[in-house]
């Protein structure tokens, strides 16, 4: 058993049929010695008396808010949550496996630049009685500070018969060094509590590996005289790190016909312009990627050929 | 060529070669074999290789003030990785495929380090740590970890040379 926060405790349980459970001793936070009684949740049934209460925690019915009283007055509370371990593996019932980029990916994180700011998000089908707490650091043995905000509900989607809820959090490294080569990863830890179930999820990454630039901005076409060719031009996104002579991007320019089956023409360039042939009803799209490190491509920025 | 004692390197040549190194480091990585171990392991390995750190002057402001600190750090790293790529870690069992880009990567690391430091001038270099893999699976694990950290190292080096070529070239 360990303390999650003041008066909230997590009991780690091996979860299998006829498992013996864990013996837990609760102590009433009071100078009083006599006349103390214990109850669980809203029930008035007295579970025991005395300054301490010993319970065998085996299942969710044994978890909840234990309260000690004296003469009708509440002295203190202890909330017991359960953390299940089945076949040697901690339960992951609360969050959905996003399966990208690999199985058992519950947290996904992205950064728009090298400033040390990043966003993480996760999915659940649970709509109520759900709380999240997020902590982060650079490295684990001698952790350096990363400050995270509160997790918020950022999207709701309908997936078949189920509703899916997306939560996200923004974090900022306290002393970021955008030009340095990271040697210790960022660690993100999410505590999830649903009713009386506790779970924790972690992710470890370098900012360089979660970079995804915003799409190029100001995408424009300039027809070339007496030609089917056009000059496409664009600019670096505002959110990308500066100076651009140091934090350079590379670009992919794509000409895509109306039908998805039509052959796509692609050009790769380090410049912020390119000359392409504009077919009727086609569209031109441009996306960006860090020039020197193969992290994610941005989403496409697009304009119609006409 | 870089001339010792504070004069500028051939920024544009260094830029071209460092960008080629980036491409090679990424093309070599998936080809050293199937690897489930790569996602595991711990922070330790990364402590054994030289990193371009915050105080090394490789940021745009530091390069403007005095690029020599940064260039020396990059040179140290290039020599270090060049030695690693020529070691038993990459030459031992399991054998690399004959057309593996690791050979080209090895040669390009040497090429860029020579651009930065001509014969007759010596910056101090870092000792290769004893990583002592005795099993093929250990070599394979180290190859992945070394190539992953090399990708990060050469990305910073390439940014330095690109910025230098754009803003510091005579």
């Amino acid at each position: 058993i360990w303390e999650l926060k003041k008066d909230v405790y997590v009991v780690e349980l091996d979860w299998y049929p006829d498992a013996p459970g864990e013996m837990v001793v609760l102590t009433c936070d009071t100078p009083e010695e006599d006349g103390i009684t214990w109850t669980l949740d809203q029930s008035s049934e007295v579970l025991g008396s005395g300054k301490t209460l010993t319970i065998q925690v085996k299942e969710f019915g044994d978890a909840g808010q234990y309260t000690c009283h004296k003469g009708g007055e509440v002295l203190s509370h202890s909330l017991l949550l359960l953390h299940k371990k089945e076949d040697g593996i901690w339960s992951t019932d609360i969050l959905k496996d996003q399966k990208e980029p690999k199985n058992k990916t519950f947290l996904r994180c992205e950064a728009k630049n090298y400033s040390g700011r990043f966003t993480c998000w996760w999915l659940t089908t649970i709509s109520t009685d759900l709380t999240f707490s997020v902590k982060s650091s650079r490295g684990s043995s001698d952790p350096q500070g990363v400050t995270c905000g509160a997790a918020t509900l950022s999207a709701e989607r309908v997936r078949g018969d189920n509703k899916e809820y997306e939560y996200s959090v923004e974090c900022q490294e306290d002393s970021a060094c955008p030009a340095a080569e990271e040697s210790l990863p960022i660690e993100v830890m999410v505590d999830a509590v649903h009713k009386l179930k506790y779970e924790n999820y972690t992710s470890s990454f370098f900012i360089r590996d979660i970079i995804k630039p915003d799409p190029p901005k100001n995408l424009q076409l300039k027809p070339l005289k007496n030609s089917r060719q056009v000059e496409v031009s664009w600019e670096y996104p505002d959110t990308w790190s500066t100076p651009h002579s140091y934090f350079s991007l590379t670009f992919c320019v794509q000409v895509q016909g109306k039908s998805k089956r039509e052959k796509k023409d692609r050009v790769f360039t380090d410049k912020t312009s390119a000359t392409v042939i504009c077919r009727k009803n086609a569209s031109i799209s441009v996306r960006a990627q860090d020039r020197y490190y193969s992290s994610s491509w941005s989403e496409w920025a697009s304009v119609p050929c006409s | 060529r870089a001339v010792p004692g504070g004069s500028s390197p051939a920024w544009t040549q260094c830029q071209q070669l460092s960008q080629k190194l980036c491409t090679l480091a990424w093309s070599a990585h998936p080809l050293v074999g199937h690897m489930d171990l790569r996602e595991e392991g711990d922070e330790e390995t990364t402590n054994d290789v030289p990193h371009i750190q915050c105080g090394d002057g490789c940021d745009p402001q530091g390069l403007r003030d005095n690029s020599q600190f940064c260039l020396q750090r990059i040179h140290q790293g290039l020599i270090f990785y060049e030695k690693l790529l020529g070691s038993d870690i990459f030459t031992g069992e399991p054998s690399l495929l004959p057309d593996s880009p690791v050979g080209q990567l090895h040669a390009s690391l040497l090429g860029l380090s020579q651009l930065l430091q001509p014969e007759g001038h010596h910056w101090e270099t870092q000792q290769i740590p004893s990583l002592s893999p005795s099993q093929p699976w250990q070599r394979l694990l180290l190859r992945f970890k070394i190539l992953r950290s090399l990708q990060a190292f050469v990305a910073v080096a390439a940014r330095v040379f690109a910025h230098g070529a754009a803003t510091l070239s005579p």
């Epitope: 040697g88 | 074999g33 199937h34 690897m35 489930d36 171990l37 790569r38 595991e40 392991g41 711990d42 330790e44 390995t45 069992e93 399991p94 054998s95 893999p133 005795s134 099993q135 093929p136 699976w137 250990q138 394979l140 694990l141 180290l142 970890k145």
Partner: antibody, heavy 121, light 111 residues
Framework: QVQLKESGPGLVAPSQSLSITCTVS????????ISWVRQPPGKGLEWLGV???????NYNSGIKSRLTISKDNSKSQVFLNMNSLQTEDTARYYC???????????????WGQGTSVTVSS | DIVLTQSPASLAVSLGQRATISCRAS??????????MHWFQQKPGQPPKLLIY???NLESGIPARFSGSGSRTDFTLTINRVETDDVATYYC?????????FGGGTKLEIK
Amino acid sequence: QVQLKESGPGLVAPSQSLSITCTVSGFSLTSYAISWVRQPPGKGLEWLGVIWTGGGTNYNSGIKSRLTISKDNSKSQVFLNMNSLQTEDTARYYCVREGDYGSYAGAMDYWGQGTSVTVSS
Amino acid sequence: DIVLTQSPASLAVSLGQRATISCRASESVDYYGISSMHWFQQKPGQPPKLLIYRASNLESGIPARFSGSGSRTDFTLTINRVETDDVATYYCQQANKDPYTFGGGTKLEIK
């Protein structure tokens, strides 16, 4: 599917040599290492040595001087040769595939049925 | 050589209960965070069969009742909800350094 089959002499006289052939199918010896493991009657397992994908070998130092492991990739065969046998070499000899280097970290994922070797006059 | 000490040497467990087998190495079998410790099951008259590789990875086709944990020098094989089919001898093996070595084995019986 993956199979390994050992074939040996069964009985060997003391001080004589032992030769066992392991024939594999379902995979290539250029992709997987093969180890030899033995088990005396009613006792535990002892690793004897390994031949790597590239043909290099490692041996258990306790019997290194008496042991040679070789292979013929084209025939999918691995050979164990051991000389100066004594009664304590009586055991079941297994030919074992070492799992993919990048996943198994030296774990032996497929075992042959083994061949019983008795050293006796 | 790395010596692997298994305990207990034999173990009797009631059906449906949990069996826990320990394997202690004379020195670390970890290499940069990868534990080269593996577990095998051997039934009478059969070759050993791989159950767990790299300390905690379940080999395909092995029931999830089997699990492994540990790092460096201390490792555990756990069998939840023991069945009659689990009666066998269990061995740990390290492949971090030559020579590869095996533990002495733990014989599991049903009470």
